[in-house]
């Protein structure tokens, strides 16, 4: 009976996500057979989050809307380890929008999920950000500095990275 009700709950939860994510890849968390964590296929997973590299070129606002439709946001990077994971899936000759912007042009950078902007956990290329007109952040590769962040005009289409919390069933 217990197993049956757990299965019913799982199925109803899976149905919630089916509209945007017809296929999930799930792994057992720890040793308890009851707990599974899932990411949409073909998203990648790191710690408690799922990531999707969107190769379509869109403006920052459209990129964020695109992530939102999938139940995600443009990526919020919280640690060096997280960035190191993300860059494994990026192409060096491309730039990708982050969920970081300064819409007022006053250098009050803000993350899309309201995570406080912490100057101590930022990975700007040297000399960046450098232009008050450029109000959105990308991550890109520079041969001298490897991967880092740069400010650019928000309306210029770029690839993007979406991030969502893992789905627990």
């Amino acid at each position: 009976n217990f197993m049956y009700s757990k299965t019913v709950k799982r199925l109803s939860k899976l149905r919630e996500y089916q509209q945007y994510h017809p296929s999930l890849t799930c792994v057992m968390e720890g040793k308890d057979i009851e707990d599974w964590s899932c990411c949409p296929t073909p998203w990648t997973s790191f710690q408690s989050s799922c990531y999707f590299i969107s190769t379509g070129m869109q403006s920052w606002t459209k990129s964020q809307k695109n992530c939102s439709v999938m139940g995600a946001d443009l990526v919020v990077i919280n640690t060096r380890e997280e960035q190191d994971f993300i860059i494994q899936n990026l192409k060096r000759n491309s730039s990708y929008f982050l969920g970081l912007s300064d819409p007022g042009g006053r250098r009050h950078w803000q993350w899309v999920d309201q995570t406080p902007y912490n100057e101590n956990v930022t990975f700007w290329h040297s000399g960046e950000p450098n232009n008050l007109d450029e109000r959105c952040a990308i991550i890109n590769f520079r041969s001298s500095e490897e991967w880092g962040w740069n400010d650019i005009h928000c309306h210029v289409p770029q690839k993007s990275i979406c991030k969502m919390k893992k789905i627990y069933i």
């Epitope: 606002t61 005009h153 309306h155």
Partner: antibody
Framework: EVQLLESGGGLVQPGGSLRLSCAAS????????MSWVRQAPGKGLEWVST????????YYPDSVKGRFTISRDNSKNTLYLQMNSLRAEDTAVYYC??????????????WGQGTTVTVSS | DIVMTQSPDSLAVSLGERATINCKAS??????????VNWYQQKPGQPPKLLIY???NLESGVPDRFSGSGSGTDFTLTISSLQAEDVAVYYC?????????FGGGTKVEIK
């Protein structure tokens, strides 16, 4: 008072080149993103190019990408548009304009009087 | 690319009467409560002049008979009481995503 004065237009044969200039005064040119917009005879407006204040980021629509190059000399308060491989459809009045951000978008708030480019054999 | 479609192509209005110009975007140009549509006025032989930005914000120095409204994909420029000096071509433009695109223009004349 903001002033933008375009020059360098003229008659050029198809396949030829032309370099337009836009001399700016009345504002701190080196802190402004700048754009070029064109208008074919009797037609509407078409965005041609944008360059950020430092000159390190440049943007173009597909119609001119690879043929036109926008640049600037902040020490001379001047914006440039180098146009190569010109075609008949590039015939237009070319305007330079200042760019003002508006949240995630922008406006073109000051425009020059324009310079006429005619591509014809 | 985002296509901006203006209507009508031309408009004849009596002095003192209201003129209304419509602009339709091929996809939404809104984000977070702002609409990225601007309106410009171009008089014969002159460069365009910014009238309205962000769909409804009046540019400094522009008479308040001009107003803008709309969101999503549908936008309107209204001249509440047409004056002789308002004879011009009016263009909408989106700045949400490159390439920036303009409407085809609406010519406003005196009836």
């Amino acid at each position: 008072e903001v002033q933008l004065l375009e020059s360098g237009g003229g008659l050029v044969q198809p396949g030829g080149s032309l370099r337009l200039s836009c001399a700016a005064s009345g504002f701190t040119f080196s802190t402004y993103t700048m754009s070029w917009v064109r208008q074919a005879p009797g037609k509407g407006l078409e965005w041609v190019s944008t360059i950020n204040s430092g000159g390190d980021n440049t943007y173009y629509p597909d119609s001119v990408k690879g043929r036109f190059t926008i640049s600037r000399d902040n020490s001379k308060n001047t914006l440039y548009l180098q146009m190569n491989s010109l075609r008949a459809e590039d015939t237009a009045v070319y305007y330079c304009a200042t760019y003002r951000p508006y949240y995630y978008g922008s406006v073109l708030d000051y425009w020059g009087q324009g310079t006429t480019v005619t591509v014809s054999s | 690319d985002i296509v901006m479609t203006q209507s009508p192509d031309s408009l004849a209005v009596s002095l003192g009467e209201r003129a209304t110009i419509n602009c339709k975007a091929s996809q939404s140009v809104d984000y977070d409560g702002n609409s990225y549509v601007n309106w410009y006025q171009q008089k014969p032989g002159q460069p365009p002049k910014l009238l309205i930005y962000g769909a409804s914000n009046l540019e400094s120095g522009v008479p308040d008979r001009f107003s803008g409204s709309g969101s999503g994909t549908d936008f309107t420029l209204t001249i509440s009481s047409l004056q002789a000096e308002d004879v011009a071509v009016y263009y909408c433009q989106q700045s949400d995503e490159d390439p920036w695109t303009f409407g085809g223009g609406t010519k406003v004349e005196i009836k």
